[in-house]
C-alpha cells in the first residue's frame, strides 16, 4: 500500500535498521526509498530534542508486517518509503539548505562566486557528494565565499548543525548534470588493484556496474565471472575507489571484467534496475515466501509487488509426466544489501531482481541499452 | 575444520556479531560455541588496553568463509568455536573467578558462609545466572560474606571489573545441579499471559521448550500451533518470564500449548538438539547452499557437517517418470537466532535442524525422550 502522507509529531517504534543524518524529512524519505530494506522512517526535525546532536537524524526502519506502532514524539516526522508507490522517482535533489552545515570529510576548498557555482563544482568532482558554502553573510570574513566539497562513507552527512551564513546541498550527478567523462566501456580480462570499499555478489558485470553506479563512493569496479578460477571469488563484484579518482594499476587476468561507475553519464539517471532473467541460476538469500505461479515473468511481478522482495528464483515445474499442473515454484528473497548472498548454477532455477527500482530510472535512461 | 588452539596477542579482524563480557577466554569460547552464528571470537584479556572498560570483552564473530584475517593486538586472545569440533561439549562451567566482579542486575543479596554456598543459592534460584561473593578479605567489613545473585538479558555480565576480595561464578543449572522443581508437562489449550522476553518460530511445542530451556532468561513458554486461527502467529514460540518465577495467568485457548523451561531438570543438561524431521514443512531462512543428495537423513548430515548451517529443507525428487535420478534437493539455511524466519506447509518439503548441538547434550540427556 502506498502511503504518501507524513505523520507530524509521531515516531515509529522499533524496526531500526540504521541512522543517517539528512537536512529534511523529504530527503530522509528519499534515502529510505533507495535503501535496500527500508520501508518506514522517522526524522527528528530541528528542535525535536534538547540535544542538538539528535536533530536531523533520519532513522531508517523495516518491519516484516510493513507497519510499526506509532508513538507521540514532539518534533518527529514519520512516514513510509516510496518503494510501495507507483510513481516515477528520482534520486536527484536540487534543494539547498540555508543555515545548515552538513558535516563530512572536507577534502577540497576553494573560493567561488555563489552557492550555485559551489554546487556545480561538487557535481563536477568525482568524490563530492555534498557541499557547504559560506555566503557573504558568514560571520568570519576570512571564510566568506569558501566552497567546501565533502564526502562520507554513506553519502549522507555524519551530522548536521545549525550555522548562520552557510548554504549546503547535494551533488547533482544523479540529475544527469555532471560534466565529467562518462566511460561506458567494460574492459575484459582486467582486474583493478585499487581500494576495495565494498563487495557484493552479482550475476554479471552489467549488474555490478549498476550497483557501483548508485553506491555512494564507488568510482569503478572489478567483477569476477562464473569462470574465474578461485571458486570463493566467483560472481564477486568489487566496488572500488582511489584518491585520484582513476584506477592506478590494471592487472591482466582472464575471466575478470572491470569498468566505471556511470554516475557522470549525462541525460541519464544511474540505471537502478536489473530487468534480465538469469537461466540455470539460483540466487541465494533470506527467504520471504514461496508461491506457486505460472512462469518467471509472474514470479518477477510477484517479487516486484512485494515491498520487501529484492530478488527471486523460479523453478519451472518438472512434472512433465503430469501436464495438468504447469505452475512452478517462486521463491521471494531479500538480503541486507539487496544482492544475493551467493549465486549457484546447474540447479535449474531462473533468477532475477524486483523491478520496483525501475521507476527510479527516468525516460532517458530506459532508452539506453545497459549493454 | 576443528581448531582447538588459541592465538595469543592476535585479534580477528571484522565479522563482528556482538560483544559480551566473559571472565576468561575459555568462557568466551563457550559463549561463541552456543551462539547460533558465532564461529570465531576475540577475547580482550585483563590489561589488554589502557581502558579497563574494554577488558574481558568477548567479541563474537562470523565469516562466510569460516576464517577472518588475523592482526597483531597485545593482550587479545582469539580462537574458534567448538561448533566445528567432534567432542562432547557442556554448557556447565564450575570455575570461580577470584578478584573479579561480574556486573549485572543485583536482585537478591544475603549473607552466606562461603563462595560455594553462594553458587548453590544461585543454582537454586530461578532467575540467577551468575553471582559475586564478598569474601572475608573484602575491604568493606560491612559487606563481607555477602552473596549477590545476578542476571542480565544475555546471561553474561554487562561488564567485568577487577575487585579485590570477591569471587564470582556462574549458576550450575546447566550442570544438572539445581534443586528447583522440574516440570516436564506440556499444557494443551493454554496461553500464559506473562512477560514476553523474546519470540521465535518453531515447528512444535517440544522445539519451543528446548529453545526456552537454553535461553538465558526464559522460565516458561507459550506455543501457537499450525491450527491457531491468527495466521501471523502460527508456529510462534513466546519465551516468557515473571518476577515470581511462575506464570500468573493461564488463558484457555484451543491450538495453543504452554510449558516450562527444563533448566532445573537434574541429571540432564538442557536438551539442545532437535532431531525430528517435519514432513510437508518448509523452513524459511537465509540460504547457505543447495546440494543434491539422496534422502532427508543425508540432507540433515550435510547440514550438521556445515558449521554455519542451522536448519534445512529437503525436496525429494518428484521426477517419478524418470526413476534414474532419485536425488532430492537439500537447502542449507541459517538465521540470526538459529530458528526459521517462517514455517510453511503444503509445499512438499521435509525440514529439520542441524544435529551439531546434540554433542552439547550429555549421556543422561539423550536417554530422556523429549516427548
Amino acid at each position: 500500500e502506498c502511503v504518501t502522507k507524513v505523520f507530524k509529531d509521531i515516531s515509529f517504534q522499533g524496526g531500526d535498521l540504521s541512522t543517517v543524518f539528512t537536512p529534511s524529512a523529504t530527503y530522509c524519505r528519499l534515502v529510505c526509498t533507495h535503501h535496500p530494506r527500508c520501508l518506514l522512517f522517522t526524522f527528528m526535525a530541528e528542535s525535536s530534542s534538547d540535544d542538538p546532536t539528535k536533530w536531523f537524524a533520519c532513522i531508517l526502519k523495516d518491519s516484516v508486517t510493513e507497519i510499526l506502532p506509532m508513538v507521540n514524539m514532539t518534533g518527529a516526522i514519520s512516514g513510509y518509503s516510496f518503494k510501495q508507490c507507483p510513481q516515477q522517482l528520482s534520486t536527484c535533489s536540487k534543494d539547498v539548505y540555508v543555515n545548515l552545515d552538513m558535516k563530512g570529510m572536507n577534502y577540497n576548498s576553494s573560493v567561488v562566486k555563489n552557492a550555485r557555482e559551489c554546487q556545480e563544482r561538487c557535481t563536477d568532482d568525482a568524490h563530492c557528494q555534498f557541499f557547504t558554502y559560506a555566503t557573504g553573510y558568514f560571520p568570519s570574513v576570512d571564510h566568506r565565499k569558501m566552497c567546501l566539497l565533502k564526502y562520507t562513507r554513506t553519502g549522507t552527512p555524519t551530522t548536521i548543525t545549525k550555522l548562520n551564513g552557510v548554504v549546503s546541498g547535494f551533488s547533482l550527478k544523479s540529475c544527469g548534470l555532471s560534466n565529467l567523462a562518462c566511460i561506458r566501456d567494460i574492459f575484459p580480462n582486467t582486474v583493478l588493484a585499487d581500494l576495495n570499499i565494498d563487495s557484493v555478489v552479482a550475476p554479471d558485470a552489467f549488474v555490478c556496474r549498476r550497483i557501483c553506479t548508485h553506491h555512494p563512493t564507488c568510482l569503478f569496479f572489478t567483477f569476477f565471472s562464473q569462470a574465474w578460477p578461485k571458486e570463493s571469488q566467483r560472481h564477486l563484484c568489487l566496488l572500488k575507489t582511489s584518491e585520484s579518482g582513476l584506477p592506478s594499476t590494471r592487472i591482466t587476468k582472464s575471466h575478470a571484467l572491470s569498468g566505471f561507475s556511470l554516475q557522470h553519464c549525462r541525460h541519464s539517471v544511474p540505471v537502478f534496475c536489473h530487468p534480465s532473467f538469469y537461466n540455470d541460476t539460483d540466487f541465494l538469500g533470506e527467504e520471504l515466501d514461496i508461491v506457486d505461479v505460472k512462469g518467471q515473468e509472474t514470479c518477477q511481478k510477484t517479487c516486484t509487488n512485494n515491498a520487501r522482495c529484492q530478488f527471486f528464483t523460479y523453478y519451472p515445474s518438472h512434472r512433465l509426466c503430469n501436464e495438468r499442473n504447469r505452475r512452478g515454484r517462486c521463491y521471494l528473497k531479500l538480503s541486507s544489501n539487496g544482492s544475493p548472498t551467493r549465486i549457484l548454477h546447474g540447479r535449474g532455477g531462473i533468477s532475477g531482481y524486483s523491478l520496483r527500482l525501475c521507476k527510479m530510472d527516468n525516460v532517458c535512461t530506459t532508452k539506453i541499452n545497459p549493454r | 575444520e576443528c581448531v582447538t588452539k588459541v592465538f595469543k596477542d592476535i585479534s580477528f579482524q571484522g565479522g563482528d556479531l556482538s560483544t559480551v563480557f566473559t571472565p576468561s577466554a575459555t568462557y568466551c569460547r563457550l559463549v561463541c560455541t552456543h551462539h547460533p552464528r558465532c564461529l570465531l571470537f576475540t577475547f580482550m584479556a585483563e590489561s589488554s588496553s589502557d581502558d579497563p572498560t574494554k577488558w574481558f570483552a568477548c567479541i563474537l564473530k562470523d565469516s562466510v568463509t569460516e576464517i577472518l584475517p588475523m592482526v597483531n593486538m597485545t593482550g587479545a586472545i582469539s580462537g574458534y568455536s567448538f561448533k566445528q569440533c567432534p567432542q562432547q561439549l557442556s554448557t556447565c562451567s564450575k570455575d570461580v573467578y577470584v578478584n573479579l566482579d561480574m556486573k549485572g542486575m543485583n536482585y537478591n543479596s544475603s549473607v552466606v558462609k562461603n563462595a560455594r554456598e553462594c553458587q548453590e543459592r544461585c543454582t537454586d534460584d530461578a532467575h540467577c545466572q551468575f553471582f559475586t561473593y564478598a569474601t572475608g578479605y573484602f575491604p568493606s567489613v560491612d559487606h563481607r560474606k555477602m552473596c549477590l545473585l545476578k542476571y542480565t538479558r544475555t546471561g553474561t555480565p554487562t561488564t567485568i571489573t577487577k575487585l579485590n576480595g570477591v569471587v564470582s561464578g556462574f549458576s550450575l543449572k546447566s550442570c544438572g545441579l539445581s534443586n528447583l522443581a522440574c516440570i516436564r508437562d506440556i499444557f494443551p489449550n493454554t496461553v500464559l499471559a506473562d512477560l514476553n522476553i523474546d519470540s521465535v518460530v518453531a515447528p512444535d511445542a517440544f522445539v519451543c521448550r528446548r529453545i526456552c530451556t537454553h535461553h538465558p532468561t526464559c522460565l516458561f513458554f507459550t506455543f501457537f500451533s499450525q491450527a491457531w486461527p491468527k495466521e501471523s502467529q502460527r508456529h510462534l514460540c513466546l519465551l516468557k518470564t515473571s518476577e515470581s518465577g511462575l506464570p500468573s495467568t493461564r488463558i484457555t485457548k484451543s491450538h495453543a500449548l504452554s510449558g516450562f523451561s527444563l533448566q532445573h531438570c537434574r541429571h540432564s543438561v538442557p536438551v539442545f538438539c532437535h532431531p525430528s524431521f517435519y514432513n510437508d514443512t518448509d523452513f524459511l531462512g537465509e540460504e547457505l547452499d543447495i546440494v543434491d543428495v539422496k534422502g532427508q537423513e543425508t540432507c540433515q548430515k550435510t547440514c550438521t557437517n556445515n558449521a554455519r548451517c542451522q536448519f534445512f529443507t529437503y525436496y525429494p525428487s518428484h521426477r517419478l517418470c524418470n526413476e534414474r535420478n532419485r536425488r532430492g534437493r537439500c537447502y542449507l539455511k541459517l538465521s540470526s537466532n538459529g530458528s526459521p524466519t517462517r514455517i510453511l506447509h503444503g509445499r512438499g518439503g521435509i525440514s529439520g535442524y542441524s544435529l551439531r548441538l546434540c554433542k552439547m547434550d550429555n549421556v543422561c540427556t539423550t536417554k530422556i525422550n523429549p516427548r
Partner: nanobody
Framework: QVQLQESGGDSVQAGGSLRLSCIAS????????MGWYRQAPGHQCEFVSH???????YYADSVKGRFTISRDNAKNTVYLQMNSLKPEDAAVYYC????WGGGRSTCVNPIGYWGQGTQVTVSS
C-alpha cells in the same frame, strides 16, 4: 588454517635496501596471485606490487625500477626486493594472496588472505 607471515622489515637509511619475505601456508600457493600493499600512518592503503600465478609482475608507478617482486613456489614464498629506498617508502608492508586491492581504512580486508604486516622505516 591460512597464514601469511611477513619478515624482513627494518630501519634503514635513505638509499638503502631491504628484502621482504612472505611465507604462505594453508592454501594452494602455486594457483594464487600474490601482492604487496603498504600503509603509512594517516594514509590510505597503497598498492605496491603484484605477481600473478604465471609469474607476470606489476608495480605501482612510485616504486617502478626500484622494487622487484618474485616468487618461489617450491618454498611457498613471495619476495619484495626494495632498493634505493626513500623516506616516503616508510610504511607497514602487507603480503596478500588473491587480494585485488586494500581496504579503505586498513589494507587488511575480507577479499583474499592477508598477513599481519612488517614495519619498514626509512630515515633521511
Amino acid at each position: 588454517q591460512v597464514q601469511l607471515q611477513e619478515s624482513g622489515g627494518d630501519s634503514v637509511q635513505a638509499g638503502g635496501s631491504l628484502r621482504l619475505s612472505c611465507i604462505a601456508s594453508g592454501f594452494t600457493f602455486d594457483d594464487s596471485d600474490m601482492g604487496w600493499y603498504r600503509q603509512a600512518p594517516g594514509h590510505q592503503c597503497e598498492f605496491v606490487s603484484h605477481i600473478t600465478n604465471d609469474g607476470t609482475t606489476y608495480y605501482a608507478d612510485s616504486v617502478k625500477g626500484r622494487f622487484t617482486i618474485s616468487r618461489d613456489n617450491a618454498k611457498n614464498t613471495v619476495y619484495l626486493q626494495m632498493n634505493s629506498l626513500k623516506p616516503e617508502d616508510a610504511a607497514v608492508y602487507y603480503c596478500a594472496a588473491d587480494a585485488w586491492g586494500g581496504g579503505r581504512s586498513t589494507c587488511v580486508n575480507p577479499i583474499g588472505y592477508w598477513g599481519q604486516g612488517t614495519q619498514v622505516t626509512v630515515s633521511s
